[in-house]
């Protein structure tokens, strides 16, 4: 807290400019009008204020907007955003994607902070669903964003948004998340032809049921081992040796190197030794 003191004569700020960096904290408090600050927020980022000075500016905005900042101010917060707490952000109503982008830019290159997580949560809840433009923006800044959502939150992703998802966005998703995303991807890509469909659906196959894997095995897709290893164990187990051979095509030889790992080790145990022997890989059930 900065004590309330009268502004020295001639120091009253007429605009937000570089002269303010020479003001002491108490002078900023006394001489900068909060309403002026709010209207000229876009200038703050161009001025090399110290962290202590930024604290004073935040304090002034907090006093002016005790119920939360308006979007016109939020959009121009810039580095002042880093001073905000999740509690502050929960008071905001952010509806513009441009505002979201501006604030994410401030945090760019850093891990998702609690502030950013709260901001995104407020934004997505305000929109009601995770639309394609929002998802595009969020995954551009945070490739792991999608996998940080709960299955319940992912259920609000419309199938149309799936087009924005890149393979690396799904790297850290667990089976429960892929269980939600896979049916949406299937719907989104349903009108594509065989080989194009497989390229698009491949990253989501960790949520695929057995019957879809059986269907893929009939389409000469030549699934690579990395994708096969990410399939749900319970979806792989009912596949026959012939179906796995068709599914993997020339990559079937890779099963030997993965025989100690799930889901391969589970699948091997459930096969007849005679069937495994047809692969000629020396797999022991």
């Amino acid at each position: 807290e900065v004590e309330k003191t009268a502004c020295p004569s001639g120091k009253k700020a007429r605009e937000i400019d570089e002269s303010l960096i020479f003001y002491k904290k108490w002078e900023l408090e006394a001489c900068v009008d909060a309403a002026l600050l709010a209207t000229q927020m876009d200038r703050v980022n161009a001025i090399p204020f110290t962290y202590e000075q930024l604290d004073v500016l935040k304090h002034k905005l907090d006093e002016l907007y005790p119920q939360g900042y308006p979007e016109s101010v939020i959009q121009h917060l810039g580095y002042l955003f880093l001073k905000m707490s999740p509690e502050d952000i929960r008071k905001w109503n952010v509806t513009s994607l441009e505002t979201l982008k501006a604030l994410l830019e401030v945090n760019k290159g850093h891990e998702m902070s609690p502030q950013v997580a709260t901001l995104i949560d407020r934004f997505v809840k305000g929109r009601g669903q995770l639309d394609k433009d929002t998802l595009d923006t969020l995954t551009a800044f945070y490739p792991g964003y999608l996998c940080s959502l709960s299955p319940e939150e992912l259920s609000s992703v419309p199938p149309s948004s799936i087009w924005a998802v890149r393979p690396q966005d799904l790297d850290t998703c667990d089976p429960r998340q892929l269980d939600v995303l896979y049916p949406k991807a299937r719907l989104a890509f349903q009108n594509m032809n065989g080989s194009e469909y497989f390229v698009k659906i491949q990253s989501f196959l960790g949520g695929a049921p057995t019957e879809d894997l059986k269907a893929l095995s009939q389409q000469n897709v030549s699934m690579d081992l990395a994708t096969f290893m990410k399939l749900r164990t319970d979806a792989v187990l009912p596949l026959t040796v012939a179906e796995v051979q068709k599914l993997l095509g020339p990559h079937v030889e890779g099963l030997k190197a993965e025989e100690r790992h799930r889901p391969v080790r589970d699948w091997i145990l459930r096969q007849r030794q005679d069937d495994l022997d047809t692969l000629g890989l020396g797999l022991q059930g």
């Epitope: 667990d174 164990t233 145990l269 059930g285």
Partner: antibody, heavy 119, light 107 residues
Framework: QVQLQESGPGLVKPSETLSLTCTVS??????????WSWIRQPPGKGLEWIGY???????NYNPSLKSRVTISVDTSKNQFSLKLSSVTAADTAVYYC???????????WGQGTMVTVSS | DIQMTQSPSSLSASVGDRVTITCRAS??????VNWYQQKPGKAPKLLIY???SLQSGVPSRFSGSGSGTDFTLTISSLQPEDFATYYC?????????FGGGTKVEIK
């Protein structure tokens, strides 16, 4: 309610073979959904997986013990067993039998039986 | 073999505290990591399976997260009955391996 119960001698002499049996009640050892494991815990130490068996008789052992371990299953008695040969004092531990499900976790454990290797 | 390294090996905490235990795998275990609680003289009890799924009957104050090589068990508000030793375990690759354990003691 599936339950597991270990049984076997609590004292084994060095160089002899440790033999334990795990009886499954409330469920079937023949279920294709589970692996049946043995795990041990030396006094005051952590947990060590010994190996598992599938109802078909397929086994998988910890390489550190493989040369001395045999796990077998008797579906008619709804039991699976552990034999550990050439034991030494280092094999003194609480031995647990446990069920591993498709999710890869040991969801059901026996209460454990203490086996001491001493002459 | 995949080595599971748990930290800390022990910690002191008070009732109501938030407690975090971490487990690092020497190579990727994908999401095949489970967490157990063990009390003296008792068998371990499954808390979390597949990195983040809560086992039926386990209180919701327990949660798990992580994938690949780094995993976390969190107890949001420690209760008197939670003082015990906690183990992580990977089931991605044989031999199945456990972490060395974390003993949670009363401060």
């Amino acid at each position: 309610q599936v339950q597991l119960q270990e049984s076997g001698p609590g004292l084994v002499k060095p160089s002899e073979t440790l033999s334990l049996t795990c009886t499954v009640s409330g469920g079937s050892v023949s279920s294709g959904s589970y692996y049946w494991s043995w795990i041990r815990q030396p006094p005051g130490k952590g947990l060590e997986w010994i190996g598992y068996i599938y109802y078909s008789g397929s086994t998988n052992y910890n390489p550190s013990l493989k040369s001395r371990v045999t796990i077998s299953v008797d579906t008619s008695k709804n039991q699976f067993s552990l034999k550990l040969s050439s034991v030494t004092a280092a094999d003194t531990a609480v031995y647990y039998c446990a069920r591993e499900g498709k999710n890869g976790a040991f969801d059901i454990w026996g209460q454990g039986t203490m086996v001491t290797v001493s002459s | 073999d995949i080595q599971m390294t748990q930290s800390p090996s022990s910690l002191s905490a008070s009732v109501g505290d938030r407690v975090t235990i971490t487990c690092r795998a020497s190579q990727s275990s994908r999401y095949y990591v489970n967490w157990y609680q063990q009390k003296p003289g008792k068998a371990p009890k499954l808390l979390i399976y597949a990195a983040s799924s809560l086992q039926s009957g386990v209180p919701s104050r327990f949660s798990g997260s992580g994938s690949g090589t780094d995993f976390t068990l969190t107890i949001s508000s420690l209760q008197p009955e939670d003082f015990a030793t906690y183990y992580c375990q990977q089931s991605y690759s044989t031999p199945l391996t456990f972490g060395g354990g974390t003993k949670v003691e009363i401060k």
